[in-house]
Amino acid sequence: MKVLQRPTCVSDYMSISTCEWKMNGPTNCSTELRLLYQLVFLLSEAHTCIPENNGGAGCVCHLLMDDVVSADNYTLDLWAGQQLLWKGSFKPSEHVKPRAPGNLTVHTNVSDTLLLTWSNPYPPDNYLYNHLTYAVNIWSENDPADFRIYNVTYLEPSLRIAASTLKSGISYRARVRAWAQCYNTTWSEWSPSTKWHNSYREPFEQH
């Protein structure tokens, strides 16, 4: 039994880090493998993660962590019974994938303006709370070509757009994701999408 693709891990910079790897053949990850992880400092405890299958030869482990700080560094040991398959380390602050934003809402009652709001996925004391920027994806359910991304580079979790920039009388969906430039994070997963019917008053044309 060998590791084909070594574990790669990302942290939500709060409570979970997720490690994925591939074995050289079909593996029952939960019965055959264990991932041990330990914070590097005196008297820290070793924790054991039981991996789950992620495709035939793929495994995934969710490592529970206390509040992450930038200095945290973990040793990782992947075991198959008494055999050490791989040894490595992981610094959560250097491999951050933010949590997805939540509670995306489209407010359509503001005089032909669409107001999209969502919630920051971090509590105020978390470092990422004040460092997230967002991308909002809006698309038409009727027309796959009508697909647009709005970059929200300010901190407020909201976006205003004129309803007239979208077609009237059809349904749209929106979703949002986050990243933090300060930690050079990857993008978060997309939030669940929300749907609305876009309608606005066409301006009266005088001839």
Partner: antibody, heavy 115, light 107 residues
């Protein structure tokens, strides 16, 4: 091995105060965020409060906000819950529980609020 | 605040039965969900975290699934020591909230 031992419970009248303590051993307390969780007699679990190891930030359940204060003394390996303006509905066994996500619990201390 | 609704609140089952408990969150919590077991007069112990990750030392007959707002705890073959009360917990945001509990009793 990890141990959490709560104390300070007892009988108190409505409107009174009580200070609970939780002494930790078997791990580096200063590196752990901590919680208080309570359970009223015959009822379910209710999270009460949290204090971060990283920032010292604190969070409270709405039911205790403004009345309870969580604190810690890393030099004494101790977690505290100062409970003021106690009400009948605060009667419960109070547990301290360690992060991440309540991996270790103390045995609890009973707080009875009654006249 | 996020509400967690567990069902059923109580159930009777026999040794060997397959038992399923569900937990519904009032809003999306991704996979930030844990399951705890509590026996009478004892302290709760964590069975599952991150919705589906089995806590080390917990028998493999326990499993968790779900994401977003719908979650399930399954005991594949109920054992005598499994008669207890089970709670779900969301830790997606503060305040953290537990479900009201499901008591699994002997039929």
């Amino acid at each position: 091995q990890v141990q959490l031992v709560e104390s300070g419970g007892g009988l108190v009248q409505p409107g009174g105060s009580l200070r609970l303590s939780c002494v930790a051993s078997g791990f580096t307390f200063s590196h752990s965020s901590m919680n208080w969780v309570r359970q009223a007699p015959g009822k379910g679990l209710e999270w009460v409060s949290y204090i971060s190891r990283a920032t010292g930030a604190v969070y409270y359940a709405d039911s205790v906000k403004g009345r309870f204060t969580i604190s810690r003394d890393n030099a004494k390996n101790s977690l505290y819950l100062q409970m003021n303006s106690l009400r009948d509905e605060d009667t419960a066994v109070y547990y301290c529980a360690r992060e991440p996500v309540f991996d270790y619990w103390g045995q609890g201390t009973l707080v009875t609020v009654s006249s | 605040d996020i509400q967690m609704t567990q069902s059923p609140s109580a159930m009777s089952a026999s040794v060997g039965d397959r038992v399923t408990i569900t937990c519904r969150a009032s809003q999306d919590i991704s996979n930030y969900l844990a399951w705890f077991q509590q026996k009478p007069g004892k302290v709760p112990t964590r069975l599952i975290y991150a919705a589906s990750s089995l806590q080390s030392g917990v028998p493999s007959r326990f499993s968790g699934s779900g994401s977003g707002t719908e979650f399930t705890l399954t005991i594949s073959s109920l054992q005598p020591e499994d008669f207890a009360t089970y709670y779900c917990l969301q830790w997606s945001s503060y305040p953290r909230t537990f479900g009201q509990g499901t008591k699994v009793e002997i039929k």
